[in-house]
Every structure is written in structure tokens, then in C-alpha cells.
């Protein structure tokens, strides 16, 4: 069963946000961070095939403005009651009687149920409040240190303008039950009879505290001589405006190629991916396009020598088993893309980083770009998926899941529509069912899975994670150079 929290958020957002302006919170841990007036950065996506993520920077608008004063009040919207129930049951039985009166009978039942009842309300900042706020206060001088860092990285910064929150504590439970029974009798000189039955019940409960943010809306900050807030989204808008004069930032030797407003590794990556192809829609938004994008990245990895591949794989396996190391590696690569030499790291993150830098501590773009792409894919996946990838890497069993995920992405086109696909037994190996690695990998992407007759129900919102899972499997498998 995938994340119960994510399922609830998805349902609430589907119900209450018809304009598609709310951004769903992806984990319960981060749900308290998104509050009105909080600043967030949009982590650029390493691919066309999965969405950028928003990350709190532990700053509020008041921290970057002066004179110092509390944030103005927010407007509380009316409360919505939300009730969602799901109940599914499949039963089957079979009886076989042979002419000589031998009998075999069996039955099985699988049921899945969940129900959620909650009150959700919105908190928002009134447009007039923004006007008053910006009229009365201005950008703090000297600029806040965190803002300076974001500027140097060329990150875009947003402010949370509205949130959907839970009114009371909510308990969400999903139950999955399986029952089976069998009987046989073989009459003859000695009558042989047997009977057996069993059941398995799995329950997943998550408690969502009162005041948890389920989804939020943002507006982009624009910072030049002062702070301003963008009213209409614009995908090309930069938060930090380049200086009005023709002044260019200087970069140390061997740094990333000169790029406008910050030396963004993501832009390096996008330039690399779109080299020689039109920037808009460089790859078609289907499985062929995804495969082409992944192959473009893989080509760089094919040039690495075996020894370096091995070191990189060992480091990556360690990083997959350690979420903090994964985050540290991501941060270090971000720092390296904009601030020159990279600070060395300990542990598995350090082992990966060592493979990507020169003795001067500068990143080697040809090596770093594929790793940044891979990390971008990995950060879309859950901790459970990371652990399973590490195990598959260790046991060199990446190709099976890779073929399965690829096949599903190909069959499920167009990705924007729900569909049901049966799974060819050849792709499942000998294990399919709850707890099997392939099952868990797909379940964590948000797909509904069927066990008795192996099938998958495609959900449009699973696209990002499925594409990221495919890219992760493909690149890790390419690095380990498993025979294709």
C-alpha cells in the first residue's frame, strides 16, 4: 500500500482545487513547514518528465523585510467537510471432482478498504494585505544570508500565499485482507483427506495532526532594488534580477560554463539535453521521449572506466540507504555548481563526490551532469524505493524491474488518462504480490495493483514517480553495466 497521507492529499486536492493551482504536500514530515508568508524554493527538475519540488527555506517574509514587525493576519476561509471511502473485494472458488470421486476445492478472497473523514479549511493572505505590507516595509539591508546564498545559486524564491489545512487530528487507515482455504479428499482403500485455511491482514494507519498543511499556493518573489511579488505565474521569470548594467559575474577557472543569473547546474543539464534540438519540448512527452532522454544521459556514463564506475556505484548504494547522505550530496552539488570548489563530505556522499571532482575541488561537468540527473530522479522516489534500489543494485537484479517499469510506461500511454493493464507473467519473475520488490516499487509510485490476476491500474499522477523510477533503474543498471 502506498503512502496513506499522499492518497488523502491527492483526493482532497482533486476535490477542492479545480484550477490546478494548489501544490500537494508530499510527506507528512514537511507538512508543517508550509505556512502563509513562508518562503520556499522551487528545486528545478532534472528532467522534462517529472515536476519540480518545493522546499522550505526556514524563512518567513518578515525575516527579509524591515522594519521588523509581525506578519499581518491571514484570512481563514470556510471549512469543507471531506469524506472518502473505498471498499473493494474480490472472491473466487473452484471445485474439481474426478470420476473416481477424488475432490479438490479451494477459495480465496482479497479485500481492500479505507475511509477518511476530515474537515479542511484554507488560510490565505488577502491581496490588499500584500500591498500594505510592501508599502510599509522594504528589503532588509544587508541582505539576509540565506537570500544571498539563493541569489548566488540563481534559485527562484516563492512565498506561500494560501494553504489548505486540517482542522482536527485525523486518523487514516487502510486495510488489506487476504483469505484462502483449500480441501481435498482421495477416497480409496485408505481415505485421505486434508483441509487448510489461512488469512493475512495488513493495516496501515497514519495520524495527521491538526493544522497540517495538505496543499499550498505560492507567488514568486521578484528582487531587484526592492522586494516585489509576482501576480501572474511566468515560467521564465527569475527572482533575482540581473544588474541593470552590462556587468557580468566573474567565475573562477574551471567553473561551470557562464550562464545568466547564477551558474545553474540544472540549466547546464538542460542545455546538455537539448543540444542540437529545439528548447521547447526537446523530447516528446511519452515513453519514447523519456527513453531518448535517459539514453542521452547514459551515453556519458558509458565513457567512464570500470574502476570509476565501481567506486561510483558503491557510493550510490550507500547514499540510497542513507537519506541524510542523499540530501548532503544534493546540497554539495548545488554548492559546487554556483560557488566554486566543493567542500569534501564524509561517508557514502563523500565517496560519490570524490568521483566527480578534480584535485582542485571543482566539479567535472561531464561526470556531474549524469549524477545530478540521477539524483533528481531519486529525490522523486520514497525512502522505501531507495532501499529496494540499493538491494537490487547489490544483488544485480535491476534489469527485471527496469523492463517491467518500461513496459508499463509504454502501455499506459497517454499518461494523462486512467487505464488498466494486465502484466505479462514473463516480466514478473516468480514473485508478485504484496511485499514483493516489484510490487512495492510500483505501489510506492501511487499505482493501484491487483494480485490474483496480475494487473496495474494506471493513475495519471503516478507519471512523475514512474518516469523517475525508470530513469533511476536505467542509469544504475547502465553504471553497473549489467549485460543487456
Amino acid at each position: 500500500m502506498g503512502s496513506a497521507f499522499e492518497r488523502v492529499v491527492r483526493r482532497v486536492v482533486q476535490e477542492l482545487d479545480h484550477g490546478g493551482e494548489f501544490i500537494p504536500v508530499t510527506s507528512l514530515q514537511s507538512s508543517t513547514g508550509f505556512q502563509p508568508y513562508c518562503l520556499v524554493v522551487r528545486k528545478p527538475s532534472s528532467s522534462w518528465f517529472w515536476k519540480p519540488r518545493y522546499k522550505c527555506v526556514n524563512l518567513s517574509i518578515k525575516d527579509i523585510l524591515e522594519p521588523d514587525a509581525a506578519e499581518p493576519d491571514v484570512q481563514r476561509g470556510r471549512s469543507f467537510h471531506f469524506y472518502d471511502a473505498m471498499d473493494g473485494q474480490i472472491q473466487g472458488s473452484v471445485e474439481l471432482a474426478a470420476p473416481g470421486q477424488a475432490k479438490i476445492a479451494g477459495g480465496a478472497a482479497v479485500s481492500d478498504s479505507s475511509s477518511t473523514s476530515m474537515n479542511v479549511y484554507s488560510l490565505s493572505v488577502d491581496p490588499n494585505t500584500w500591498q500594505t505590507l510592501l508599502h510599509e516595509r522594504h528589503l532588509r539591508q544587508p541582505e539576509h544570508k540565506v537570500l544571498q546564498q539563493l541569489r548566488s545559486r540563481g534559485d527562484n524564491v516563492y512565498v506561500v500565499t494560501e494553504v489548505l489545512q486540517t482542522q482536527k487530528e485525523v486518523e487514516v487507515t487502510r486495510t488489506h485482507k487476504r483469505e484462502g482455504s483449500g480441501r481435498f479428499s482421495l477416497p480409496g482403500a485408505t481415505c485421505l483427506q486434508g483441509e487448510g485455511q489461512g488469512h493475512l491482514s495488513q493495516k496501515k494507519t497514519v495520524t495527521i495532526p491538526s493544522g497540517s498543511t495538505l496543499a499550498f499556493r505560492v507567488a514568486q518573489l521578484v528582487i531587484d532594488s526592492d522586494l516585489d511579488v509576482l501576480l501572474f505565474p511566468d515560467k521564465k521569470q527569475r527572482t533575482f534580477q540581473p544588474p541593470a548594467t552590462g556587468h557580468k559575474r566573474s567565475t573562477s577557472e574551471g567553473a561551470w560554463p557562464q550562464l545568466p543569473s547564477g551558474l545553474s547546474m540544472m540549466r547546464c543539464l538542460h542545455n546538455f539535453l537539448t543540444d542540437g534540438v529545439p528548447a521547447e519540448g526537446a523530447f516528446t512527452e511519452d515513453f519514447q521521449g523519456l527513453r531518448a532522454e535517459v539514453e542521452t544521459i547514459s551515453k556519458e556514463l558509458e565513457l567512464l572506466d570500470r574502476e570509476l564506475c565501481q567506486l561510483l556505484l558503491e557510493g550510490l548504494e550507500g547514499v540510497l540507504r542513507d537519506q541524510l547522505a542523499l540530501r548532503a550530496l544534493e546540497e554539495a552539488l548545488e554548492q559546487g555548481q554556483s560557488l566554486g570548489p566543493v567542500e569534501p563530505l564524509d561517508g557514502p556522499a563523500g565517496a560519490v563526490l570524490e568521483c566527480l571532482v578534480l584535485s582542485s575541488g571543482m566539479l567535472v561537468p561531464e561526470l556531474a551532469i549524469p549524477v545530478v540527473y540521477l539524483l533528481g530522479a531519486l529525490t522523486m522516489l520514497s525512502e522505501t524505493q531507495h532501499k529496494l534500489l540499493a538491494e537490487a543494485l547489490e544483488s544485480q537484479t535491476l534489469l527485471g524491474p527496469l523492463e517491467l517499469v518500461g513496459s508499463l510506461l509504454e502501455q499506459s500511454a497517454p499518461w494523462q488518462e486512467r487505464s488498466t493493464m494486465s502484466l505479462p507473467p514473463g516480466l514478473l519473475g516468480n514473485s508478485w504480490g504484496e511485499g514483493a520488490p516489484a510490487w512495492v516499487l510500483l505501489d510506492e509510485c501511487g499505482l493501484e495493483l491487483g494480485e490474483d490476476t496480475p494487473h496495474v491500474c494506471w493513475e495519471p499522477q503516478a507519471q512523475g514517480r514512474m518516469c523517475a523510477l525508470y530513469a533511476s533503474l536505467a542509469l544504475l543498471s547502465g553504471l553497473s553495466q549489467e549485460p543487456h
Epitope: 531587484d224 516585489d228 501576480l231 511566468d234 527569475r238
Partner: nanobody, 121 residues
Framework: QVQLVESGGALVQPGGSLRLSCSAS????????MSWYRQAPGKERELVAT????????NYADSVKGRFTISRDNAKNTVYLQMNSLKPEDTAVYYC??????????????WGQGTQVTVSS
């Protein structure tokens, strides 16, 4: 002071092309949504196309979709309207409009004087 100056209007044959320009001064151009409107004789002024502050998003009237393209150059404080496959019904005075696209500029709107486009054989 604030100025919007349109240029590029002309007499053109049906099926022909024109490129209108609107040069802005006296305000922070990059904080404004820019739009092109047109007004044919005896008709109301209608919105033709709009572009957001950094040029990332555009919007068009159904009657010009696929034929007209709006673009902007914030370094030159200029917005453009590329008009292809022109039809007689595109004949009008074309106006440029700047509307505040941020909280600080939200209440500000500026108009140009207009440039005449005539499509006729």
C-alpha cells in the same frame, strides 16, 4: 514620464505579414504584463494578445491563434506582435497596453497612441 510608442503599422495585402513594435519608457518594464489590443472602425476595442512579465506565458484571442505571436525583449523595453496570414478583418488601430504584473505595480495601467494596420488588396 511614462511613454508607450507603437510602430510598424502599414497597408498590407491579404495573406501578408507585419511586425508591430511597442517601445516603453518611464517605468520598470519587466514588472508589467504587456498586451496588444485593436479597435476596428465602429467596433469595441478587443484584446488580441497578452504576455507575462518575463515572456514565459502568452495568451491569444481565438480569432488570431496560430497566426499572431506576441513576444518581448526586457533588455530593450519592447514588446512585439508578429502578424502572419493577415485577413481584411484584421484591419484596425492596434494599441499597446502595460498593466502592473506585481503587487507594487498592480494599480498601474498605461496605453499607447496606436498604429494603423490596413489589410486590403
Amino acid at each position: 514620464q511614462v511613454q508607450l510608442v507603437e510602430s510598424g503599422g502599414a497597408l498590407v495585402q491579404p495573406g501578408g505579414s507585419l511586425r508591430l513594435s511597442c517601445s516603453a519608457s518611464g517605468f520598470t518594464f519587466s514588472k508589467y504584463l504587456m498586451s496588444w489590443y485593436r479597435q476596428a472602425p465602429g467596433k469595441e476595442r478587443e484584446l488580441v494578445a497578452t504576455i507575462t512579465t518575463a515572456g514565459g506565458n502568452t495568451n491569444y484571442a481565438d480569432s488570431v491563434k496560430g497566426r499572431f505571436t506576441i513576444s518581448r525583449d526586457n533588455a530593450k523595453n519592447t514588446v512585439y506582435l508578429q502578424m502572419n496570414s493577415l485577413k481584411p478583418e484584421d484591419t484596425a488601430v492596434y494599441y499597446c497596453k502595460a498593466s502592473g504584473g506585481t503587487i507594487r505595480t498592480v494599480n498601474e495601467t498605461y496605453w499607447g497612441q496606436g498604429t494603423q494596420v490596413t489589410v486590403s488588396s
